[in-house]
């Protein structure tokens, strides 16, 4: 099928495009084209005789264009005008016709933008600043770039009129900013200049610096006054309220206790007409004041809060020092001076940071101490502790319950018995209890400061029998000749007497056992293997008297000294060499054969079949405890002897 | 071997008192609680109280509270019983008992008794 | 008090065969204990701590319960069994006895 193609088919003005003819049929007798999408004589561009290689123009021919014999039309110099459909009439030598049409669009080659803007010198958090990008232009696209970087989302920037007009609504200091816009159509792209956006703005509160407030008579006072401003701030100083000059800086060589007094920095913004002043209050010493200490926090909470203490006044060129508990600070990374030493950081305080702190001020001649300082850390509650301890109780006793919790400020406490509340007192008292006072006893203690609060929970048996009692143990699995083991008789109770038997027999003497806590524990220092036995311990009173199941001790020990058995050393060449080892441990040890300090296998025997004289060496057994961490080893020398050489020589296995 | 000796049988009359004694051998009283139960004639057993010899410490059942009064003397290694205001209802065995360990066993030993007869 | 009541009162059985007698609790309590009582002399412990047996007393006997309920048990009758059994509970004051349960024998 015939078709025409525009290249290109978006044609600049100026520059030239060529309708290109594809699928052109042959035995052509000739070819026309027209402008628009039909045959129209009145809007005929050229014709072309095949047989004459004749081109004849037409009533649209403009001069500009050229055909060529593949059909093909080349428009030179194209116009805004040409834009548009173009038809192709092709007459075939059966004078049949055939038609196809083209099209391509016009566009102007766009000038080099510019921004124009309503204010040159908008004023921060009041003016609003609308760019707009020149000239307009039809059909052209426009975009924005801000620091070369495509517009940032913000509710404060709005496109308008076609995206040609940016407005900034209650600009701010950090629109200053390099703006570009930019123009596009199908056939070009152009960038303006960077306009930059000048925000008028400040001054803000101004700093005097230094920070130090303190001084020594005889020092040269200079202060210097900035304020974020633009334009840049005029500055002006005041001394206890009167005018002194016009500058940046202050200075005041060799002060006395005069120069005492308010210093005011005023910074003055000429454009936005905006005033602001700082005031800092300098004191001259006629000699180191007593130093004091300011905390940042009055009451910091124990693992969570941090605490700086700086030593009052601050003055230049003075040594600053520390004292924690009457002593030097100590090694901790929870202790942190500043460059001047003249405040301390305590990170994470603990109830154990609560000091008393003192600062000193170097001079000359002495050390100036400021008064001590106590942190009054919050803490706690930790766990409450019910006393006594007994769990049984006999009816018609009194009851008297105490709890205790570490906690600053002091805890405050409940008593809640099943889970019902009875009181809220650190005491609680029952006179003539019955076994109906059994039951769930706990202790509430809340810290008000810090709103957390514990519970420890108690369970009370009143009864005048006594349960069967129970062993409990510090250490399961003692390492023999290092750890000590205590056994403690359950459960607790009044007027009770403890009782402890080894293997059904009364306790021996040894220095190793000691009763403690009313013979309730037994504890048995440095534990060795023939301590693993069966220990019971039995409770009486005014009613029952009962035995504990036995608990027996498992004490790791070893590995001794291993044993390689059979004991011979010499062996016949061509017989079985069969050795085990054994070595007392608990647990059972893992074994491991070497050779000539060559690693061989991880068992208990090793076996080696029809040995030679190349089997003569060093036989070592190696004996590892995992539990206790302990190895042993021993060494054993095999001599083989080939068969026949010497009498009296193992046969082997 | 552990043994509770008890005085022997008393005749008295209603209104009067009376104070049996339990003595211990083969161990000491001071470390063991001495209990006392009454048996009527043909009738079942009836605590009466304990006392802890070490300290005096006692704990009587209701019923004998004013009626019966517990002592001891280490010294002697004897525990007593003190029936006080005596009537025909305080006729019967007095028994002396006390639940010790005995090497590893916890073994109950009991006196013989100690029959008392109050007559009008 | 807690009151300990036996059933049967009386009973007899003859040898061989098995026993039961029980021991029931007003109020709960931690263990039971059995005493053993023969004409003319003084009691002797039979059962502690509910399921334990005195030194002495032969396999045959046994003790169970918990709670209130609580029984003694002879496998197979003998004659020197026949005698009265009393339960003890001492929970709590007063240590209070049931009224005894006697056991004769066929």
């Known amino acids: 099928k015939l078709t025409i193609e525009s290249t290109p088919f978006n044609v600049a003005e100026g520059k030239e495009v060529l309708l290109l003819v594809h699928n052109l049929p042959q035995h052509l007798f000739g070819y026309s084209w027209y402008k628009g999408e039909r045959v129209d004589g009145n809007r005929q561009i050229i014709g072309y005789v095949i047989g004459t290689q004749q081109a004849t123009p037409g009533p649209a021919y403009s001069g500009r264009e050229i055909i060529y014999p593949n059909a093909s039309l080349l428009i030179q110099n194209i116009i805004q005008n040409d834009t548009g459909f173009y038809t192709l009439h092709v007459i075939k030598s059966d004078l049949v016709n055939e038609e196809a049409t083209g099209q391509f669009r016009v566009y102007p080659e766009l000038p080099k933008p510019s921004i124009s803007s309503n204010n040159s010198k908008p004023v921060e958090d009041k003016d609003a600043v609308a760019f707009t990008c020149e000239p307009e232009t039809q059909d052209a696209t426009y975009l924005w770039w801000v620091n070369n970087q495509s517009l940032p989302v913000s509710p404060r920037l709005q496109l308008s009129n076609g995206n040609r007009t940016l407005t900034l609504f209650n600009v701010t200091r950090n629109d200053t900013a390099s703006y570009k816009c930019e123009t596009q159509n199908p056939v070009s792209a152009r960038r303006s200049d960077s306009v930059i956006l000048n925000v008028l703005y400040g001054p803000d509160a101004p700093t005097i610096s230094p920070l130090n407030t303190s001084y020594r008579s005889g020092e040269n006072l200079n202060l210097s006054c900035h304020a974020a401003s633009n334009p840049p701030a005029q500055y002006s100083w005041f001394v206890n309220g009167t005018f002194q000059q016009s500058t940046q800086e202050l200075f005041i060589p060799n002060i006395t206790v005069n120069n005492s007094g308010s210093y005011t920095c005023q910074a003055h913004n000429s454009d936005t007409g905006l005033n602001r002043t700082t005031v800092t209050t300098i004191t001259v010493y006629a000699e180191p004041p007593k130093p004091f200490i300011t905390s940042n926090n009055s009451n910091p909470v124990e693992d969570e809060d941090a605490v700086a203490l700086t030593c009052e006044p601050e003055i230049q060129n003075t040594t600053y020092l520390w004292w924690v508990n009457n002593q030097s600070l100590p090694v901790s990374p929870r202790l942190q001076l500043s460059n001047d030493n003249r405040t301390l950081t305590l990170l994470s305080v603990t109830r154990n940071d609560v000091g008393p702190y003192e600062c000193g001020i170097q001079n000359e001649l002495s050390v100036d101490h400021s008064d001590p300082v106590i942190l009054n850390v919050l803490y706690g509650p930790d766990d409450p502790t019910i006393s006594p301890s007994y769990t049984y109780y006999r009816p018609g006793v009194n009851l008297s319950l105490s709890c205790h919790a570490a906690s600053n400020p002091p805890a405050q406490y409940s008593w809640l018995i099943d889970g019902n509340i009875q009181q809220h007192t650190q005491e609680l008292f029952i006179s003539n209890i019955t076994e109906k006072n059994s039951g769930l006893y706990t202790c509430q203690a809340n810290n008000s400061a810090s709103g957390h609060s514990r519970t420890t929970v108690k369970t009370i048996t009143v009864s005048a029998e006594l349960p069967k009692p129970s062993i409990s143990s510090n250490n399961s699995k003692p390492v023999e000749d290092k750890d000590a083991v205590a056994f403690t008789c359950e459960p607790e109770a009044q007027n009770t007497t403890y009782l402890w038997w080894v293997n059904g027999q009364s306790l021996p003497v040894s220095p190793r056992l000691q009763l403690s806590n009313g013979n309730r524990t037994l504890t048995l220092f440095n534990v060795t293997r023939n301590d693993a036995r069966a220990y019971v311990c039995g409770i009486q009173n005014s009613v029952s008297a009962n035995r504990s199941d036995p608990v027996t001790l498992d004490v790791l020990y070893g590995p001794d000294t291993p044993i390689i058995s059979p004991p011979d050393s010499s062996y016949l060449s061509g017989a079985n060499l069969n050795l085990s080892c054994h070595s007392a441990s608990n647990p059972s040890p893992q074994y491991s054969w070497r050779i000539n300090g060559i690693p061989q296998q991880h068992t208990q025997v090793l076996f080696i079949a029809k040995i030679t004289p190349n089997n003569n060496g060093t036989y070592a057994c190696f004996v590892s405890n995992l539990a206790t961490g302990r190895n042993n080893s021993i060494v054993k020398s095999i001599t083989v002897s080939a068969s026949g050489t010497s009498p009296g020589l193992s046969a082997g296995a | 071997e552990v043994q509770l000796q008890q005085s022997g049988a008393e005749l008295v009359r209603s209104g009067a008192s009376v104070k049996l004694s339990c003595t211990a051998s083969?161990?000491?009283?001071?470390?063991?609680?001495m209990h006392w139960v009454k048996q009527r004639p043909e009738q079942g057993l009836e605590w009466i109280a304990w006392i802890d010899p070490e300290n005096g410490d006692t704990e009587y059942a209701p019923k004998f509270r004013g009626k019966a009064t517990l002592t001891a003397d280490s010294s002697s290694n004897t525990a007593y019983l003190h029936l006080s205001s005596l009537t025909s209802e305080d006729t019967a065995v007095y028994y002396c008992?006390?639940?010790?360990?005995?090497?590893?066993?916890?073994?109950?030993?009991w006196g013989q008794g100690t029959s008392v007869a109050v007559s009008s | 008090q807690i009151v300990l009541t036996q059933s049967p009162a009386i009973m007899s059985a003859s040898p061989g065969e098995k026993v039961t007698i029980t021991c029931s609790a007003s109020s709960s309590v931690t263990y039971m204990h059995w005493f053993q009582q023969k004409p003319g002399t003084s009691p002797k412990l039979w059962i502690y701590?509910?399921?334990n047996l005195a030194s002495g007393v032969p396999a045959r006997f046994s003790g169970s319960g918990s709670g209130t309920s609580y029984s003694l048990t002879i496998s197979r009758m003998e004659a020197e069994d026949a005698a009265t059994y009393y339960c003890q509970q001492r929970s709590t004051y007063p240590l209070t006895f049931g009224a005894g349960t006697k056991l004769e024998i066929k």
């Open positions: 008992h006390v639940l010790i360990y005995a090497g590893y066993l916890a073994m109950d030993y």
């Open positions: 701590s509910t399921s």
């Open positions: 083969g161990f000491n009283i001071k470390d063991n609680y």
